[in-house]
Interface confidence: low
């Protein structure tokens, strides 16, 4: 994981400002595979290459995100860049042989946040729950929610209770949890990012 994202970033960073603008406009109308949503126009048009790479990966995952990027580049007449992107993506990545459809990543669904993608692993493996609660208290957790999580007897049940509140959270709230996880158990986040 990470190779395709870096390849997308490399490609987008090499576009001129005008080309990047054109890329975004084409991305708004490019045909998408069934089940994938479109990045909102307002957010898309203001992004730089790094932000756009993030969005492509979060909306379409690495493999399809790279494929989509290459398609748009090709549509812009940038065949060589599209070829380099696809070569970099497949280089040593254990990609499925030509003609064989790689199975979809079961853990990651289009548009899902990191904490939703790795819900089961986080419930099982987070040990420093109290620290997370302190980081989230007053920002995304009410006093009542904070106490409800603390009342659970084990770390997994605490995390399960915490996840019962996340459906009401927006991206920024979930990012707060991710940031807190990075600070309290960075090795776990890194392990999940690699998985």
């Amino acid at each position: 994981m990470g190779r395709a994202r870096d390849a997308i970033l490399d490609a987008l960073e090499n576009l001129t400002a005008e080309e990047l603008k054109k890329f975004k406009l084409k991305l708004l109308s490019v045909p998408l595979r069934e089940g994938y949503g479109r990045i909102p126009r307002g957010a898309l048009l203001s992004m730089d290459a790094l932000d756009l790479t993030d969005k492509l990966v979060s909306f379409y995952l690495e493999t399809y995100g790279a494929e989509l990027t290459a398609n748009v580049l090709r549509d812009m007449g940038l065949q060589e860049m599209a070829g380099q992107l696809q070569a970099a993506t497949h280089q040593g990545s254990g990609a499925a042989p030509a003609g064989i459809q790689a199975p979809p990543q079961s853990a990651a669904k289009p548009g899902l946040h990191f904490i939703d993608q790795h819900r089961a692993a986080l419930i099982a493996r987070v040990t420093n729950v109290e620290w997370l609660l302190d980081a989230l208290y007053g920002k995304v957790l009410t006093d009542e929610q904070y106490q409800a999580v603390r009342a659970e007897p084990t770390n997994p049940s605490k995390m399960r209770k915490l996840f019962s509140f996340t459906p009401a959270w927006n991206w920024t709230c979930k990012d707060l949890l991710l940031q807190a996880l990075r600070e309290s158990q960075s090795y776990l986040v890194e392990d999940l990012e690699r998985s």
Epitope: L9, A43, M47, D48, D54, T172, D175
Partner: antibody, heavy 124, light 107 residues
Framework: QVQLQQSEPELARPGASVKLSCTAS????????VSWVRQRTGQGLEWIGR????????RFNEKFQGKATLTADTSSSTAYMELRSLTSEDSAVYFC?????????????????WGTGTTVTVSS | DIVMTQSHKFMSTSIGDRVSITCKAS??????VAWYQQKPGQSPKLLIY???FRYTGVPDRFTGSASGTDFTFTITTVQAEDLAVYYC?????????FGGGTKLEIK
């Protein structure tokens, strides 16, 4: 403990170059980006540019394009900024900063950890 | 470039008071504004990001809010150690820009 340790103060002649270093500890270097910020004496803060160490990709404030070069050595968790063709206008404190990098695509360009700062003095 | 304007260069307050520092963006920045504290001779320190989210370990007397392109940073109960310069920064678009700073002085 997350820290960014910057190199010692630099005294340079006009026209010369200096290379500042910023060594990260307490976190995984390639999971975050590094930005550089300038502060002239008694002045505010100016963003110079950033590097994403995982890929080496850089982005600059146009004002500093051609003035600064950013590199990173992942093996030593160190980011570097070289400033060339120095003039008295470049005399300032230079900070390296860390920025988070997440999957969400939100605007993540705030600087959550700051280095100790390196003072650069350009004088003949 | 997006210009961030902090209208007050200096603000005077007393220990225990509530004080608010304002910052205005020259265009829409989607609430992507951070606030930093810089004490004399020290590096800046992140307090608030995305307008209202307190960074880890920051005391809850520090709060932030947004209304359109106007951003407000508030210290609900000023303490002696809060004497510093406070900067706003937009983290929405390149080049990432800072306000000119507001120096908080204790009466």
């Amino acid at each position: 403990q997350v820290q960014l340790q910057q190199s010692e103060p630099e005294l340079a002649r006009p026209g010369a170059s200096v290379k500042l270093s910023c060594t990260a500890s307490g976190y995984t270097f390639i999971n975050y980006g590094v930005s550089w910020v300038r502060q002239r004496t008694g002045q505010g803060l100016e963003w110079i540019g950033r590097i994403y160490p995982r890929s080496g990709n850089t982005r600059f404030n146009e004002k500093f394009q051609g003035k600064a070069t950013l590199t990173a050595d992942t093996s030593s968790s160190t980011a570097y900024m070289e400033l060339r063709s120095l003039t008295s206008e470049d005399s300032a404190v230079y900070f390296c900063t860390r920025f988070p990098y997440a999957f969400s695509g939100n605007s993540y360009w705030y600087f959550d950890v700051w280095g100790t700062g390196t003072t650069v003095t350009v004088s003949s | 470039d997006i210009v961030m304007t902090q209208s007050h260069k200096f603000m005077s307050t007393s220990i225990g008071d509530r004080v608010s520092i304002t910052c205005k963006a020259s265009q829409d920045v989607s609430a992507a504004v951070a606030w930093y504290q810089q004490k004399p001779g020290q590096s800046p320190k992140l307090l608030i990001y995305s307008s209202s989210f307190r960074y880890t370990g920051v005391p809850d007397r520090f709060t932030g809010s947004a209304s359109g392109t106007d951003f407000t940073f508030t210290i609900t109960t000023v303490q002696a150690e809060d004497l510093a310069v406070y900067y706003c920064q937009q983290h929405f678009d390149t080049p990432y820009t800072f306000g000119g700073g507001t120096k908080l002085e204790i009466k």
